[in-house]
Interface confidence: low
Amino acid sequence: EVEKTACPSGKKAPEIDESLIFYKKWELEACVDAALLATQMDRVNAIPFTYEQLDVLKHKLDELYPQGYPESVIQHLGYLFLKMSPEDIRKWNVTSLETLKALLEVNKGHEMSPQVATLIDRFVKGRGQLDKDTLDTLTAFYPGYLCSLSPEELSSVPPSSIWAVRPQDLDTCDPRQLDVLYPKARLAFQNMNGSEYFVKIQSFLGGAPTEDLKALSQQNVSMDLATFMKLRTDAVLPLTVAEVQKLLGPHVEGLKAEERHRPVRDWILRQRQDDLDTLGLGLQG
């Protein structure tokens, strides 16, 4: 530890400003009052401090708020947020969406760090559920956020929040997650007309049961092969050749290219050859 504590005459910082970038670490420690720093945190982001200098500023805040920073300070942390550890963040009580946005902005363009994951976890737990505004914000910054949650965590997502979900937000979800999300989506979109409903529900269909797929096949939805390939195998197997033909519409010809891949492969093996031949695709059961 570098111990240079006595502030040289005339160096006491009256405010947080550009002149502090010329202070060495020990001078920041000695000459910047922690309470002043806390009240002028919004200025820190505009000053090009080095990582080492930011370490000192963090240290001062830690000493001022050993039980965790108040939200007024957290909201203005800016790049200092990158210096926080998950342990630091677990002490926080973040309730404002504006605070969350401000901190996510700092990490924008990077993968979700353990710090961000902890921050989001604290925020969502504080709110009690993943409401639409929060989900909107989180998926805007991290399209893969929803798929990073466990099925248990996803169970707390209210159906109304599903409106904030975009197709790309579900790209990395596995079947267990879609099993949880699909019923919520079905409920959220239940009052839409057929064609609009399919557009919205399409990305969630990896969690759909057989009976829902059968119902969709009666609605001329023309499901594309990419969506079909993401369906649960156990949900696809009971479908008849006629139902799959109706479900896929003009896209049925794509089955030939996918005949060696699940769930198409497994579905073909369950069908009578005579029925497959009606498709005229040369599929062999």
Epitope: E1, V2, E3, K4, T5, A6, C7, P8, K24, K25, W26, E29, D33, A34, A35, K60, E63, L64
Partner: antibody, heavy 112, light 112 residues
Framework: EVQLQQSGADLVKPGASVKLSCTVF????????MHWVRQRPEQGLEWIGR????????IYGPKFQDKATITADTSSNTAYLHLSSLTSEDTAVYYC?????WGHGTTLTVSS | DIVMTQAASSEPVTPGESVSISCRSD???????????LYWFLQRPGQSPHLLIY???NLASGVPDRFSGSGSGTAFTLRISRVEAEDVGVYYC?????????FGAGTKLELK
Amino acid sequence: EVQLQQSGADLVKPGASVKLSCTVFGLNFKDTFMHWVRQRPEQGLEWIGRIDPANDNSIYGPKFQDKATITADTSSNTAYLHLSSLTSEDTAVYYCLYFDNWGHGTTLTVSS
Amino acid sequence: DIVMTQAASSEPVTPGESVSISCRSDKSLLHSNGHNYLYWFLQRPGQSPHLLIYRMSNLASGVPDRFSGSGSGTAFTLRISRVEAEDVGVYYCMQHLEYPLTFGAGTKLELK
């Protein structure tokens, strides 16, 4: 590991000047703050002053304002203590230090 | 200047027992960051001083946890539990709150 290597013992005559050196190893010298402390025979410790090698800014204890000059050479990672108008009162061990690291001390004897 | 006072010039102790060494300052050493800038050094016979405790209660690296520092504002205590032969020497307190840095006169720990 940080090491502070001080110059050897010196015997000088009253009225003369002397320059003691302290070379730092294992540390970024510009990030240091080199202090000098003296200890007269059978006495306690007295702070002489310190230098910031990055900008040569130095501060002295009131008692040493006219006695001591601390300088630093960043190219050799060495701090110097220049003592002038020496009297027998200046006979002491002079230590350079950086926070928790002390040199072994240089014994200065002022005698005719 | 801040005056540091170590009332006891010597402290006799039996090996294995505990001992407390006290130090006072004539001004509070509490910095606005919540730390008390009080240091403890040990100078063993014939050696340079070395740091034991910094910021009143923090153990310097390599120092056994038999040593502990406490206090507040102007009154400070260095406690050594289970004193060993190697603990013999002069203990100095020093304030690092403002310049000039000042030391106490020292307390000599002697074995009975």
